[in-house]
């Protein structure tokens, strides 16, 4: 009704199901990851399933080894196609150490900021991909608690390749990467036999990430 008490046409905005997520992928790029092509293939398969855009899902990528690099921010690209092109161009930065706690903490403190494109009220999801025990694992408890405090959902992926190639026990490594994953662990933790097998978990990982939207 208008101020003059005339009937006017009005409409309410269409109520959509939320399809908004801010996803930051935290990639181990240390020297032991091999072949890197398997990582970019995994990224391609995962990202092409996403409806990426400023009002839909946003994706940022952080790579770490000894140090941390923001490959691109959440708001850098506004379509799935653009993100796919950018992800293909990510080069392995290397590093003799695997600073997983630092990678996660940098993603939390920096990648999920509004300055880098994070949106208020939108669910935050972190996907951590690594192939070895971290050198800074004594800092993980704090880092994970900080993520919990900020309601960041974490999916963690353990690549067992370097352990299997060296015939080493994976027990400690798997425990560490499980500790990174959100609860329930069985829904948030994945392990693959080697880098090539990353693509085999894409479908399930994607489904579990997007189940968070509901």
């Amino acid at each position: 009704v208008s101020p003059t008490f005339q009937v006017v046409n009005s409409f309410a905005p269409v109520q959509e199901c939320s399809t908004q997520l801010d996803i930051v992928i935290v990639l181990d790029g240390s020297n032991s990851i091999y072949p890197w092509d398997s990582v970019t293939a995994f990224l391609n398969d995962l990202l092409e399933r996403m409806d990426i855009g400023p009002k839909q899902t946003q994706v940022g990528i952080v790579q770490y080894g000894e140090n941390v690099t923001h490959e691109f921010n959440l708001n850098k690209y506004s379509s799935t196609e653009e993100v796919l092109v950018a992800a293909k161009k990510i080069v392995q930065r290397g590093g003799r150490q695997t600073m997983t706690a630092l990678g996660i903490d940098t993603a939390r403190k920096e990648a999920f900021t509004e300055a880098r494109g994070a949106r208020r009220g939108v669910k935050k999801v972190m996907v951590i991909v690594t192939d070895g025990e971290s050198h800074d694992n004594h800092r993980l408890k704090k880092v994970i608690q900080d993520c919990e405090d900020e309601n960041i959902q974490r999916f963690s992926i353990a690549i067992l390749g370097s352990y299997n190639r060296g015939n080493l026990s994976t027990e400690k490594f798997v425990e560490e990467i499980k500790s990174i994953a959100s609860e329930p662990t069985e829904k948030h933790f994945f392990n693959v036999s080697d880098e090539l097998a990353l693509v085999t978990i894409v479908k399930t990982l994607g489904e579990r990430i997007f189940a968070l939207e509901a």
Epitope: H135, Q145, D146
Partner: antibody, heavy 117, light 108 residues
């Protein structure tokens, strides 16, 4: 603001166990964003990290002392403690407790422990 | 363990002068895990810088830090009387956490 206060005997006999407690005031030890550390400083020397504990009870120790050190936490009392067994004169030092987030930003004033018979 | 070597051991300067303190690591340290402390006689250390170059709360801007990899520097642009103390670097990226041996900044 958060303050830390060490307490415990200032004199310990050789071969005995050194026991110190750090009481946290002005904030909860259960807030999960910090590690709670013990550091020591031998007379006229530099600083040595002994170890730290997370509120959940997870501990991390300096390997050089690991066989003799136990750090524990009592969240109900807002305290954490250090036990160092089989002490010798080489363990005579000022012992500090500290809060560790991105570096140790809050310290106790330190307590001098002398190991002597 | 990562060994941090600080130099010089003692720095003799006058108030108003610039102090440059070095911290060298035996292996690469992420700058995010490098901190600096100041300690005065009879007192506990005080956090000055974290992330190698970020000032802790209440630290004046005459204190600055730089460096990466194995070489880090603490600079005090103009020494004030209260700045004469011992300075320690520390890394916490690798366990055990380790401190440098310290640099004493004394009045010339």
């Amino acid at each position: 603001q958060v303050q830390l206060q060490e307490s415990g005997p200032g004199l310990v006999k050789p071969s005995q166990t050194l026991s110190l407690t750090c009481t946290v005031s002005g904030g909860s030890i259960s807030r999960g964003n910090y590690y709670w550390s013990w550091i020591r400083q031998h007379p006229g020397k530099g600083l040595e990290w002994i170890g730290y504990i997370f509120y959940s009870g997870s501990t991390y120790y300096n390997p050089s002392l690991k066989s003799r050190v136990t750090i524990s936490v009592d969240t109900s009392k807002n305290q954490f403690s250090l036990k160092l067994s089989s002490v010798t004169a080489a363990d005579t030092a000022v012992y500090y407790c500290a809060r560790d987030g991105y570096g140790m930003d809050v310290w106790g004033q330190g307590t001098t422990v002398t190991v002597s018979s | 363990e990562i060994v941090l070597t600080q130099s010089p051991g003692t720095l003799s300067l006058s108030p108003g002068e610039r102090a440059t303190l070095s911290c060298r690591a035996s292996q690469s340290v992420s700058s995010s895990y490098l901190v600096w402390y100041q300690q005065k006689p009879g007192q506990a250390p005080r956090l000055l810088l974290y992330d190698a170059s970020s000032r802790a709360t209440g630290i004046p801007d005459r204190f600055s830090g730089s460096g990466s990899g194995t070489d880090f520097t603490l600079t005090i642009s103009r020494l004030e009387p209260e700045d004469f103390a011992v300075y320690y670097c520390q890394q916490y990226g690798n366990s055990p956490l380790t401190f440098g041996g310290g640099t004493k900044v004394e009045i010339k």
